[in-house]
Interface confidence: low
């Protein structure tokens, strides 16, 4: 079928359009183009005869049309009037006619639009602004852009006049933006330049900074005021209602208590005619005095006295702080603070409470600290210690004993031998001792301030012969694979060699055996049951030698995994079941039985007479050692068959 295609369909003024023919029949006589939807001789544009290849213009020919041999029509330099329908009339060789109609539309090229406004300086929350896109153009579509985005949905935005006018009702400062309009038709689109909306607003309630309201006497006061405003606000300062200056900042150097009061900032916008004010109350404080600590007892006695420390001076509405040993107060039932924190009471002082103590007064801008105070706690004397620790000496050597007892003030010392006073010194020295110097040596320590005395007595033996030694132990019943045992050979004697034997043999080499303290102490680490042997220590010097009685180590161990005997697991019905359980353990373990999980008796032997198949099941023996706190168990399955059903079964016990 014969058809006409317009390329393009929408044509801009001044451009060209091609009316392209499709499915043109063969064997043609000629064809003719007409303006309009029908063949009308008065509106013929051009005709074409194939045989002569001659084109003949018609009444509607404008001189801008070109016809091609394929019947297509090109129209150049399009004008608005060219819009509409075009009809092709084809005359075939058999003189049968065929017609086809095509069309196109002509649009003008749009000019660059511009925006006009009815209000160049609208006031926030008061005015409306109407933007209009110029010029008014037929068959054009109008679009609007805000900050290069399409219009937001808002009840304050309204389009009218075929979208040519954009109205912003009740403008706000947020409407300050770049506005553009765009015109479009099928052949062109143009955008205007930006128009920036200048919304007048404010001033808002001003902000005074910094926010602090408390100052110390002698400081500088520097306040700054700011209020959001367009155009920028003009500022004025008032102190206690009296005008000061018209500046954004207020500076007062070296303030005093007299500068306390209400400070008002006023912001004014000359365009909107609005004023807003903010008031801040400034308080100027005088410097507080440096605190100091007083005590109700400068020399308290340990475990007897209480001490009350008070932070001076007393100031109303002040926070008092305390520190001990440069730390904040520890939680202790012996430390009590008064309701106002000014008094710290130490109940029943100890020697560790000496301090130092500090108190602080919290003023508005800082913490002022007292000088540290140290308590002189009177204590002691504790039980005196006599050194060295030797108790056996050989004749002819010098005896030099020293005594010390913790005490404040330092203790005064006295020595007694067999109850007789010797001298008032901390050290006792006797040269070239003999057997006659053997006896009870007593050190007495006395605290003159508290009036307390303590004594320690030491037995000194002077002898050429060494005494029979003995073995002391730090653990008489160690647990296997857990405990260590330290044996010590007593007594400690000067110039003496210490030796050890285990089961009559010298010590074996073992990483678990360690000698220390001049071989006087033998330590066994991680004891095992094999360490349960006889231990002997010996002492010797150039004159004599002696051995201790043996000490046998009692190692607690087990219980090991028990064994149930006899080992048989199959029995004949009617036989007696007699099971015995045994586990290696020290001390002997406690035994208990369970059959199929049900507790039975607490015996080492389980006896059941004349068993039947009902006695089938699991027999568990449980062992526990209360000394080691350990447990163990074993399970055995027993099968009882009816008499004569299975060869080789045990007849039982």
């Amino acid at each position: 079928k014969l058809t006409i295609e317009s390329t393009p369909f929408n044509v801009a003024e001044g451009k060209e359009v091609l009316l392209l023919v499709h499915n043109l029949p063969q064997h043609l006589f000629g064809y003719s183009w007409y303006k309009g939807e029908r063949v009308d001789g008065n509106r013929q544009i051009i005709g074409y005869v194939i045989g002569t290849q001659q084109a003949t213009p018609g009444p509607a020919y404008s001189g801008r049309e070109i016809i091609y041999p394929n019947a297509s029509l090109l129209i150049q330099n399009i004008i608005q009037n060219d819009t509409g329908f075009y009809t092709l009339h084809v005359i075939k060789s058999d003189l049968v006619n065929e017609e086809a109609t095509g069309q196109f539309r002509v649009y003008p090229e749009l000019p660059k639009p511009s925006i006009s406004s009815n209000n160049s300086k609208p006031v926030e929350d008061k005015d409306a602004v109407a933007f209009t896109c110029e010029p008014e153009t037929q068959d054009a579509t109008y679009l609007w852009w805000v900050n290069n985005q399409s219009l937001p949905v808002s009840p304050r935005l309204q389009l009218s006049n075929g979208n040519r006018t954009l109205t912003l009702f009740n403008v706000t400062r947020n409407d300050t933006a770049s506005y553009k309009c765009e015109t479009q038709n099928p052949v062109s689109a143009r955008r205007s330049d930006s128009v920036i909306l200048n919304v007048l607003y404010g001033p808002d309630a001003p902000t005074i900074s910094p926010l602090n309201t408390s100052y110390r006497s002698g400081e500088n006061l520097n306040l700054s005021c700011h209020a959001a405003s367009n155009p920028p606000a003009q500022y004025s300062w008032f102190v206690n209602g009296t005008f000061q200056q018209s500046t954004q900042e207020l500076f007062i150097p070296n303030i005093t208590v007299n500068n306390s009061g209400s400070y008002t900032c006023q912001a004014h916008n000359s365009d909107t005619g609005l004023n807003r004010t903010t008031v801040t109350t400034i308080t100027v404080y005088a410097e507080p005095p440096k605190p100091f600590i007083t005590s109700n007892n400068s020399n308290p006695v340990e475990d007897e006295d209480a001490v009350a420390l008070t932070c001076e001076p007393e100031i109303q509405n002040t926070t008092y702080l305390w520190w001990v040993n440069n730390q904040s107060l520890p939680v202790s039932p012996r430390l009590q603070l008064s309701n106002d924190n000014r008094t710290l009471t130490l109940l029943s002082v100890t020697r560790n409470d000496v301090g130092p103590y500090e108190c602080g007064i919290q003023n508005e801008l800082s913490v002022d600290h007292s000088d540290p105070v140290i308590l002189n706690v009177l204590y002691g004397p504790d039980d005196p210690t006599i050194s060295p620790s030797y108790t056996y000496y050989r004749p002819g050597v010098n005896l030099s004993l020293s005594c010390h007892a913790a005490s404040n003030p330092p203790a005064q010392y006295s020595w007694l031998i067999d109850g007789n006073i010797q001298q008032h010194t901390q050290e006792l020295f006797i040269s070239n001792i003999t057997e006659k110097n053997s006896g009870l040596y007593t050190c007495q320590a006395n605290n003159s301030a508290s009036g307390h005395s303590r004594t320690t007595v030491k037995t000194i033996t002077v002898s050429a012969e060494l005494p029979k030694p003995s073995i002391s132990s730090n653990n008489s019943k160690p647990v296997e694979d857990k405990d260590a045992v330290a044996f010590t050979c007593e007594p400690e004697a000067q110039n003496t060699t210490y030796l050890w034997w285990v089961n009559g043999q010298s010590l074996p080499v073992s990483p678990r055996l360690q000698l220390s303290n001049g071989n006087r102490t033998l330590t066994l680490f991680n004891v095992t049951r094999n360490d349960a042997r006889a231990y002997v220590c010996g002492i010797q010097n150039s004159v004599s030698a002696n051995r201790s009685d043996p000490v046998t180590l009692d190692v607690l161990y087990g219980p090991d995994t028990p064994i149930i005997s006899p080992p048989d697991s199959s029995y004949l019905s009617g036989a007696n079941l007699n099971l015995s359980c045994h586990s290696a353990s020290n001390p002997s373990p406690q035994y208990s039985w369970r059959i199929n999980g049900i507790p039975q008796q607490h015996t080492q032997v389980l006896f059941i007479a004349k068993i039947t198949p009902n006695n089938n099941g699991t027999y568990a023996c449980f062992v526990s050692n209360l000394a080691t706190g350990r447990n163990n168990s074993i399970v055995k399955s027993i099968t009882v068959s009816a008499s004569g059903t299975s060869p080789g079964l045990s007849a039982g016990a």
Partner: nanobody, 119 residues
């Protein structure tokens, strides 16, 4: 000139952590007490934590006890607020302020740092 400058705020999920810093200049923080005060729309201003750096004296609001830790580095003249197990109700502008340890008076303030706790 006295200045307090906060940093470290931001957006964090519930249960998360943030560490706020408060750098002081113009005075010595070991001679005073520093606090963190928060302001949220529709809520009362709250002093959440305070420290007297001289001896590490600290106090906390019940709402943050066990979750927030206040500390100070006197060598850097800086106070910190470590905020753990953050909740939506911790969303606020956090100000560092020179405060009385017992609360009540806030003197020098920083400009604030915003903490938003949201999933």
């Amino acid at each position: 000139e006295v200045q307090l400058v906060e940093s470290g705020g931001g957006l964090v999920q519930p249960g998360g952590s943030l560490r706020l810093s408060c750098a002081a200049s113009g005075f010595n923080i070991k001679d005073t007490c520093i606090g963190w005060v928060r302001r949220a729309p529709g809520k009362e201003e709250e002093l959440v934590a305070a420290i007297c750096p001289y001896k590490g004296y600290t106090r906390y609001a019940d709402s943050v006890k066990g979750r927030f830790t206040i500390s100070a580095d006197t060598s850097k003249n800086t106070a910190y607020l470590q905020m753990n197990s953050l909740r939506a109700e911790d969303t606020a502008v956090y100000y560092c302020a020179n405060v009385a340890y017992s609360g009540g008076h806030y003197n020098y303030w920083g400009q604030g740092t915003t903490v938003t706790v949201s999933s």
